[in-house]
Each structure stands twice: as structure tokens, then as C-alpha cells.
């Protein structure tokens, strides 16, 4: 019996009965938030052998072992993970051992076993036999191994029953509990599973099997399950489903969902039956089960029940994330906010079409409308009173509509209205009339020439750069000295610069009226000598990095025909010089014969230019005498040389500082103080723990359904 799509057991332990007939859970299994300690001994689910996604246990009081609950759980596939983990055991107050003695394979993902104060038998499990890679496992804050005294079956009677493996240079017995060994297959099986009697299973089996070399006797399948057989790929006219089985077209067509996108059903794409077309694809027609590639961003139609969507905060903008067509009207009213321009671009930047009108009013936080960076059509199917489909009123800091050199916007029906936008030049509005095709629709009062742009430098002259010089981390630029009609009106210059990998930035990128600005700004005073051209040295720059730079003249509000005269340059793109690259990363060397070394590394994090070659140097070193000091035939523990592996063991860190003999006459001395790198690693570790805990809480705490 297949259960799914994911089972969430919380609050009441009797809900566990839902697992009674499950052999495969197609999805995840959550058991969590059972605060009353219960006796779980009467609950046993021997049928359950596979979980296709992940297993999460969190705050289940009274549960001491998982072995009785799931004695035959063999495979956790990890098709979908919980924060990169396929097995999470977190804050299980009474858990004494994991006890999943039949767990043989976690196909994808790592394990996270954390903050389980009573949990032992962790150091006796060799996770490398279950997982492909153990480096991402996170086993922290459980009962200290010294307090556990874990003993594998038979060790007390000096008749050990379990097999040994090496973990962290320790060769030891491997077991799940005091009476359950960790199962290992004979080396002759290689990567294959084996039966209870150590006979090798069929290569398509995963975890275990009931008969050797038989693809119909597998407990779980390495690849896919179809009609009772484990197969390497789904047969013709069948499709992969949930990462573990093959289904036919009818099956896929008849899957029902309770999610909002359900009206069109599941699709078949790239040999897989899935809920929706993947990113970059769209259904080939509304009732189609097949996907075709999108031209440009995939359309996503969003509709507002009340017809008009008010955007007055980042939260309200968030609802439009990914939308390309907005059915309704947009009312933008952003009075304040933090980093508002880039947040709005993030959530509204894909909108291409608005079917109704767009109204922007009292949006004092906006400097530009460039956050609507893909808007190309306002249909004006619904209009404001007076037949307006684009209405811009009282936006105290609005300076730019869009960059009309790189923008095509059509307003199909309706007029435009602009009033009380003191920093928005009328020339900018006239340009919009031309681009949008609304010229001639507006009457005289619709674009107010007196209260639009009355506090802006609208009649702009162009500043020309005269020279640029670069080094690896500096740029020196100079420009023509600007001479306004009255030289006393020129106060200073402001230089704006920022990293620009591509030559597509505009003056208003990431800028809002609340202080957020993606440009760095430097003020430049006028040179006292009238014949010297103004200039600046920009320093502290990155090597081999392209920067965008422009300059603005800061002038007095000298009115000429009701408008201020000003000057600014075009945006100049300039790259700093190359420099010495940072060191190559992750250098590893290994010997594959008596006369060869294989050396591998990753490129430097900061190439600071185009890398053309690497230099590898080596030298012979004397043999370490340390290796000859120990009698390797003695039964004493062999000294272990520990090499830094870039991580720190939290368990280790929390112990008291060890004293160690420092050689010669020195006697015992304290552990060395932590290096900056170690402190930083600890800080990052603590941060990572917090992020995971937040993710856990956000994922599992939901309002009561009743």
C-alpha cells in the first residue's frame, strides 16, 4: 500500500494509526509536537519499508527508540529534502537510540541529529554504509559519547556479534542498539544489497531483498519500480513519478490535487509525470498534458479579486512575484520603505501587461518607475474617471519614469495624467507620450507644466570626460569644467560609481528616496584655479572589475523659464587593471604510485584578471621520524595524526580545554587560544544552527485547521 503525499503526525500520538497499512510513504513523514509522554510500545509498523522523501522527528515526548515503530524501514530516498536533509532528529527529549536497524540506504541528502539530550549509539553507526557522502552530516548537541558507554551486542561477553569498520581512524564494532548490529553486506557484493543470509541481491535492488539476484524480490528499487519489477529506466509509454516508480498516461491524467494550480492537472515532460511544467516551460494549450519552451519569461497570469491591487509595501508587492500578466489595476502608493526600489523590482519586475490602469500617487519613496522593468503594455480596459489609464499624482521625489532609450511601452487605450511631481521634468513626460503612442490624447490640463519638474534640473547640459587613467585598484578621471550662465551658481560636482559587470545600468538603478542607492557617491569641490579641469581619484576598487561612473554638477536653483539648469555626464564604463590572483583553493595531493603525485585544486576566488596558467612547485622533504617512534605490533592505541579538515567538531569545542604535554621539561600546558579562523568558523556554525532552527519552526508551525 502506498500512502502519501507526505504524512504529518502531530499533537496526538494516536494519529500514528494512519501508518498502519503503509509499505511506501510517497512523500515525507513528519512525527512532531507530541508533548504528552506516551507508551509507544503498542505501535509497530513493520510494513513500512520506504519513505520517498524525508523523515523528520521533532519534540515527541516519551519515544525512546525508532526501532520498534519502524523495524523494517530500509530506504529513505530523499527525492525532496528538508533543508538538505533526508533524516532530521531534532529536540527528541527522550530518544535513547535511533534503532533503525534495517535502514540500509539514504539515497540523497544528509542527516541532521541535533539537540537530543539523551541520545546515544551515534558513534557506533557507520553512516558511510548508508549514505554516499557523510561530510554534510550534522550530529551535534546530543548526549556526550563519554556518558553513553555504548556497547554493541556480545561485547560484554567477549563474543562480539557485530562487524567492525573504521570511522575517523577508529576501528570499531558497528551497531544500532545494545542488541542490534548494523548490517553489512559481503565485499563480494560491491555496491549491491544483500539478503539476511548475505546473498547478493539483483543490481537493481536497493537496501535489501528477499531472494538473491531477483529483480522482483527487492525491498526497494535502485532506480524505478514498475509492475512488481525493479527497472533501470521506465519502459516505453510509462513515466517517472515521484522519483521512484513508473506510471502510465492515464494514471498521470487522473492525479487530483488540492493546490491552486490544480485546474489543469498533472503534466508529462521529459519522461516524467509532474504537477506543473518546469521553469522555462508552459503547457501546450490549457487542457494539454505536455509542455513546450516559453519564449522569454513564462507567462503567469495574476488576478486581483477586488480588481485594483494596492501596492503600499514590500509585502503587498510580494503577492505579484513571478506575475507577467496582471488582470486588473495597479495602484502604487509607496510612502516609505527600506531598499524599496530593488525589493519592488524583485517582486514586480516580471510584469509585462496590465489589463486595467496604472495609478502612482503619494509615492514619495520612489525616484524612478524602472522597477517595472518589463512593463510593455497597459491595455486600459478599465480606466479612471476622466478616461485615464496612466495617472501620476503627487510623487515628491519621482525623477525618472523609465529609460526611454531601452524601453517600449504601449498604452492601448486611455489618457495620461501628471500633476505635482516636482522633480519630474516635463520633457520626460513628453518623451513618454511619444513612446507610448498617447500623443494627442491628452488635453491641456492633463500634463501640468508648472507643478511637474519645478524643483529639478530639467535643462541639462552634458559634461564630457577628458581623461581616464586606471591601475589595479584605482581610477583617475577628469572632466570639462562646466560653466553655467552665472559661474556663481556652480557649487560642486558629485561623482557616482558602482561595479557594473554589464553595460546596462541606469542612473536610477536601485535608488529610492529613503536613502537606498546602489551607487557610491563622492563630492568633488571646484578646483580653485579656473583653468584646471575638475577630477577625482577613486580608490579601494577591485582589480579587473568594470565600473560605471557618471558625474553631476551641483547647481543653485537658478530659474530660467521656471526651470533649473543643470549638467551631468553620460555613464562611462571603465575597467580596472588586472592584478595578482588570490591563492588557488582546496589544494589536494595524493599518490597513485611510488613515483607519482596527483595534485588537484580549485581556481582562486578572486582571479583579478584572466587566468592563463598555474605554476606548480614541489620539493622533496625528509621522511618524518615520528612514524618510526611507535611499535605498531603493540596493542596500545596507534597514535593518530589529525589533519585540519576545515571544519570544527562542536562536541569537541564544548569540552574543557585539554592539557597536553608540550615536550621536554615543559610539563603540561593549556590548550592554545583559538585562532581568528576558528572563532569565525564557530560564529558561522552558530549562525547556521540558527538558520536551520528558524527554517524548521517556519516549516512546521501552522495554524490549527479547525
Amino acid at each position: 500500500e502506498i500512502c502519501g503525499p507526505g504524512i504529518d503526525i502531530r499533537n496526538d500520538y494516536q494519529q500514528l494509526k494512519r501508518l498502519e497499512n503503509c509499505t511506501v510513504i510517497e512523500g515525507y513523514l513528519h512525527i512532531l509536537l507530541i508533548s504528552k509522554a506516551e507508551d509507544y510500545r503498542s505501535y509497530r509498523f513493520p510494513k513500512l519499508t520506504v519513505i520517498t522523501e524525508y523523515l523528520l522527528l521533532f519534540r515527541v515526548a516519551g519515544l525512546e527508540s525508532l526501532g520498534d515503530l519502524f523495524p523494517n524501514l530500509t530506504v529513505i530516498r530523499g527525492w525532496k529534502l528538508f533543508y538538505n536533509y533526508a533524516l532530521v532528529i531534532f529536540e527528541m527529549t527522550n530518544l535513547k537510540d535511533i534503532g533503525l536497524y534495517n535502514l540500509r540506504n539514504i539515497t540523497r541528502g544528509a542527516i541532521r541529529i541535533e539537540k537530543n539530550a539523551d541520545l546515544c549509539y551515534l558513534s557506533t553507526v557507520d553512516w558511510s554504509l548508508i549514505l554516499d557522502a557523510v561530510s554534510n552530516n550534522y550530529i551535534v548537541g546530543n548526549k556526550p559519547p563519554k556518558e553513553c558507554g555504548d556497547l554493541c551486542p556480545g561485547t560484554m561477553e567477549e563474543k562480539p556479534m557485530c562487524e567492525k569498520t573504521t570511522i575517523n581512524n577508529e576501528y570499531n564494532y558497528r551497531c544500532w542498539t545494545t542488541n542490534r548490529c548494523q548490517k553489512m553486506c559481503p565485499s563480494t557484493c560491491g555496491k549491491r544489497a544483500c539478503t539476511e543470509n548475505n546473498e547478493c541481491c539483483h543490481p537493481e535492488c536497493l537496501g535489501s531483498c528477499s531472494a538473491p539476484d531477483n529483480d522482483t524480490a527487492c525491498v526497494a528499487c535502485r532506480h524505478y519500480y514498475y509492475a512488481g519489477v525493479c527497472v533501470p529506466a521506465c519502459p516505453p509509454n510509462t513515466y517517472r513519478f515521484e522519483g521512484w516508480r513508473c506510471v502510465d498516461r492515464d494514471f498521470c491524467a487522473n492525479i487530483l490535487s488540492a493546490e491552486s494550480s490544480d485546474s489543469e492537472g498533472f503534466v508529462i515532460h521529459d519522461g516524467e509525470c509532474m504537477q506543473e511544467c518546469p521553469s522555462g516551460f508552459i503547457r501546450n494549450g490549457s487542457q494539454s498534458m505536455y509542455c513546450i519552451p516559453c519564449e522569454g519569461p513564462c507567462p503567469k497570469v495574476c488576478e486581483e479579486e477586488k480588481k485594483t491591487k494596492t501596492i503600499d509595501s514590500v509585502t503587498s508587492a510580494q503577492m505579484l512575484q513571478g506575475c507577467t500578466i496582471f488582470k486588473g489595476n495597479l495602484l502604487i502608493n509607496i510612502r516609505r520603505g527600506n531598499n524599496i526600489a530593488s525589493e519592488l523590482e524583485n517582486f514586480m519586475g516580471l510584469i509585462e501587461v496590465v489589463t486595467g490602469y496604472v495609478k502612482i500617487r503619494h509615492s514619495h519613496a520612489l525616484v524612478s518607475l524602472s522597477f517595472l522593468k518589463n512593463l510593455r503594455l497597459i491595455l486600459g480596459e478599465e480606466q479612471l474617471e476622466g478616461n485615464y489609464s496612466f495617472y501620476v499624482l503627487d510623487n515628491q521625489n519621482l525623477q525618472q519614469l523609465w529609460d526611454w532609450d531601452h524601453r517600449n511601452l504601449t498604452i492601448k487605450a486611455g489618457k495620461m495624467y501628471f500633476a505635482f511631481n516636482p522633480k519630474l521634468c516635463v520633457s520626460e513626460i513628453y518623451r513618454m507620450e511619444e513612446v507610448t503612442g498617447t500623443k494627442g490624447r491628452q488635453s491641456k490640463g492633463d500634463i501640468n507644466t508648472r507643478n511637474n519638474g519645478e524643483r529639478a534640473s530639467c535643462e541639462s547640459d552634458v559634461l564630457h570626460f577628458t581623461s581616464t587613467t586606471t591601475s589595479k585598484n584605482r581610477i583617475i578621471i577628469t572632466w570639462h569644467r562646466y560653466r553655467p550662465p552665472d559661474y556663481r551658481d556652480l557649487i560642486s560636482f558629485t561623482v557616482y560609481y558602482k561595479e557594473a559587470p554589464f553595460k546596462n545600468v541606469t542612473e536610477y538603478d536601485g535608488q529610492d528616496a529613503c536613502g537606498s542607492n546602489s551607487w557610491n557617491m563622492v563630492d568633488v569641490d571646484l578646483p580653485p584655479n579656473k583653468d584646471v579641469e575638475p577630477g577625482i581619484l577613486l580608490h579601494g576598487l577591485k582589480p579587473w572589475t568594470q565600473y560605471a561612473v557618471y558625474v553631476k554638477a551641483v547647481t543653485l536653483t537658478m530659474v530660467e523659464n521656471d526651470h533649473i539648469r543643470g549638467a551631468k555626464s553620460e555613464i562611462l564604463y571603465i575597467r580596472t587593471n588586472a592584478s595578482v590572483p588570490s591563492i588557488p583553493l582546496d589544494v589536494l595531493s595524493a599518490s597513485n604510485s611510488s613515483s607519482q603525485l596527483i595534485v588537484k585544486w580549485n581556481p582562486p576566488s578572486l582571479p583579478n584578471g584572466n587566468l592563463s596558467y598555474y605554476i606548480v612547485r614541489w620539493q622533496r622533504q625528509p621522511q618524518d621520524g615520528y612514524l618510526y617512534r611507535h611499535n605498531y605490533c603493540s596493542k596500545d592505541k596507534i597514535p593518530i595524526r589529525k589533519y585540519a579538515d576545515g571544519t570544527i567538531d562542536i562536541e569537541e569545542v564544548t569540552e574543557n580545554p585539554k592539557t597536553e604535554v608540550c615536550g621536554g621539561e615543559k610539563g603540561p600546558c593549556c590548550a592554545c587560544p583559538k585562532t581568528e579562523a576558528e572563532k569565525q568558523a564557530e560564529k558561522e556554525e552558530a549562525e547556521y544552527r540558527k538558520v536551520f532552527e528558524n527554517f524548521l519552526h517556519n516549516s512546521i508551525f501552522v495554524p490549527r485547521p479547525e
Partner: nanobody, 123 residues
């Protein structure tokens, strides 16, 4: 936990009609796929029909296609089964079931079940 209560069962003559209802206690009713199953005397559990969360899509067993119609009213947290042209072989206890998020055609292990309502078709 979601409570489900079926009603509307009873005795009906062959060829007659009956409408079953299933009231759910959950305020997130639309986030469940809902289903009707039945169990005839001395037989196993049989799938009858299922409906998606929004009510836009439905599946039926071959034995009831064209005669039974499943529907739901999410504002009233209620599931319905309209049964027309009833036959003697439709006699069974009818169970309403709910599963969160999704239901595949082979799913019988639904998360929540009602107690059942008896439908008897006899002359």
C-alpha cells in the same frame, strides 16, 4: 484532526436517486482532495469517486460513470455525491475520505475517514 460526517443514506428503489453529503470540520477544506468509497456486504473497500480541492476536476470508477456526480461546496465545507439510476449492486456503506494536498488514482490510504452511511437499493 479533521472530522467527517456522512448523511443522506437510506432505502431507495432501483432506478431511483439519492444525494449523499459529507460535512467536514476543517476550515481549510479546500486543501483536501475528497473522495467517496463504498463497501458492499461481505466485500472489500471500493473506490467510487474523487474530486480536486477546487472542485474543477473529478474521477469516477467505471461502474458508476455517467450515473454518479461528485461535487463540493468549499464555502460550506461539504462534499456531495449525487447518485442517479441506482442499481441493486450499488447497495453498500458509503464512506467519505479526505487527503491533504493530493491523491493518486491508486491511493486507498486516505488520511481521514467518516463513519459511513448505508445506502440500500431494493424493490
Amino acid at each position: 484532526e479533521v472530522q467527517l460526517v456522512e448523511s443522506g443514506g437510506g432505502l431507495v428503489q432501483p432506478g431511483g436517486s439519492l444525494r449523499l453529503s459529507c460535512a467536514a470540520s476543517s476550515r481549510t477544506f479546500s486543501s483536501f482532495v475528497m473522495s467517496w468509497f463504498r463497501q458492499a456486504p461481505g466485500k472489500g473497500l471500493e473506490f467510487v469517486s474523487a474530486i480536486s480541492g477546487s472542485g474543477s476536476r473529478a474521477n469516477y470508477a467505471d461502474s458508476v460513470k455517467g450515473r454518479f456526480t461528485i461535487s463540493r461546496d468549499n464555502s460550506k465545507n461539504t462534499l456531495y455525491l449525487q447518485m442517479n439510476s441506482l442499481r441493486a449492486e450499488d447497495t453498500a456503506v458509503y464512506y467519505c475520505a479526505a487527503n491533504p494536498r493530493r491523491a493518486t488514482p491508486d491511493l486507498t490510504q486516505y488520511a481521514y475517514w467518516g463513519q459511513g452511511t448505508l445506502v440500500t437499493v431494493s424493490s
